[in-house]
């Protein structure tokens, strides 16, 4: 029996192929076998099928990086990493995606889900669209909706200062942030650390954070697979 999706375009299609263990998988942008991309799939959180595109867990990876690094991606997909803005832009251009953010700290956990998530192309400076919040972490991403991505060497924020420079990270900064998941790991100084404002505020750096995405219609696809 052939696979449902011989060239899965995301982790949800990998899951629908029968792969239910979290780990590294190859996906294919637009189902094109020449556009292979290795990703980490979270197959357990809220039904699974998530492409993880950011993980913070121990501070071993340097996230204070330039525009080129954030465009391309960096790090070890099994450990701390950033998948890359170019990849995110291509993936979210495939259809309607949702965003999930998982946060953990000293036994506590919280999450945020956004029904509609996309990252624009390089021309838009990877403009963020994030709408339709639900969850327990608080709607901190709302503030960043519509913003372009900023790094210390490409300042696209609306602040007088360079937000990425001031807070030693990179993000879809406005003036400056309510979310700083690419901030300095373990730094509890105001606004410098791994922050999700409406959960732990700006004076506490969160121990574990993941950002992930999957098709917004995943529930329907999953139901179809089960019926089949």
């Amino acid at each position: 029996i052939g696979l449902l999706y011989p060239f899965p375009r995301d982790c949800s299609q990998a899951m629908l192929n029968g792969d239910t263990t979290s780990g590294l998988y190859t996906i294919y942008i637009n189902g094109d076998k020449t556009q292979a991309l290795e990703v980490y799939c979270d197959m357990t959180s809220d039904g699974g099928g998530w492409i993880v595109f950011l993980r913070r867990k121990n501070g071993r990876e340097d996230f204070y990086r330039n525009w080129k690094a954030y465009a391309a991606g960096f790090g070890d997909r099994r450990e701390e990493f950033w998948l890359g803005l170019d990849n995110l832009s291509k993936i979210t251009a495939q259809g309607q995606y949702e965003l999930r953010v998982d946060l953990q700290d000293h036994g506590e956990s919280a999450y945020a889900v956004y029904d509609r998530f996309s990252v624009g192309d390089a021309k838009s400076r990877y403009k963020l669209k994030v709408e339709g919040y639900s969850g327990t972490a608080g709607d901190s991403m709302n503030y960043h909706n519509g913003r372009s991505f900023s790094t210390y060497d490409k300042d696209t924020d609306s602040a007088i200062t360079n937000c990425a420079l001031s807070y030693k990270g990179a993000f879809w900064y406005k003036n400056c942030h309510r979310v700083n998941l690419m901030g300095r790991y373990g730094d509890n100084n105001h606004s410098q650390g791994v922050n999700w404002f409406h959960w732990k505020g700006h004076e506490y750096s969160i121990q574990f954070a993941e950002m992930k995405l999957r098709p917004s219609n995943f529930r329907n696809l999953e139901g179809r697979r089960k019926r089949a």
Epitope: Y133, D139, N142, Y143, N145, I160, N175, C176, H202
Partner: antibody
Framework: QVQLVESGGGLVQPGRSLRLSCAAS????????MHWVRQAPGKGLEWVSG????????YYADSVKGRFTISRDNAKNSLYLQMNSLRAEDTALYYC?????????????WGQGTMVTVSS | DIQMTQSPASLPTPVGDRVTITCRAS??????LNWYQQKPGKAPKLLIY???NLETGVPSRFSGSGSGTDFTLTISSLQPEDFATYYC?????????FGQGTKVDIK
Amino acid sequence: QVQLVESGGGLVQPGRSLRLSCAASGFTFDDYAMHWVRQAPGKGLEWVSGISGSGGSTYYADSVKGRFTISRDNAKNSLYLQMNSLRAEDTALYYCAKSYQSDEDAFDIWGQGTMVTVSS
Amino acid sequence: DIQMTQSPASLPTPVGDRVTITCRASQYIQGFLNWYQQKPGKAPKLLIYDASNLETGVPSRFSGSGSGTDFTLTISSLQPEDFATYYCQQSYSTPQTFGQGTKVDIK
């Protein structure tokens, strides 16, 4: 053009209730958080309450928590403030205001205000 | 709650002069600071958002600066239509709070 028009103010006795309305036009109403801000006669501005674009999140000043309820009807492009157990110190001009972008943000559009007087 | 302290409370100024109003937050608020102008009998009008961004349609003689806890609104050359009360507001956290206002009147 973008416009906010408040209504529902008036003279009310202490302990009674009043419901303010704000009719919005000229923008996609459900895309924006909305707020109520008040100004007592001869005094400064005081934020009262806010609500997210979907209506899923609501916020209140401590001075009105448990007495006032903010709500919205996106189908009618309308914002409301239900004010119960009114006190003399609630006497003010009540403004409806649109959030610039996110829930906690600058207020870029304001209505003309509706006066609430609480007196026996 | 975050307290916002404006100074001065009153500022008599001749037309054409430079005006500087300061606003101090009781805690660090990044750049989450907005400025409004209010004329008697009128609703407030947004002038500056996010500390330094001029709202559309606001004359370029208005400017904002500052970050963290200390912020400034500057009118480079006061015009007759600028006589009004000016308020700062923090949008860093709920409840959003306003300064007590600075009344700029004719000297």
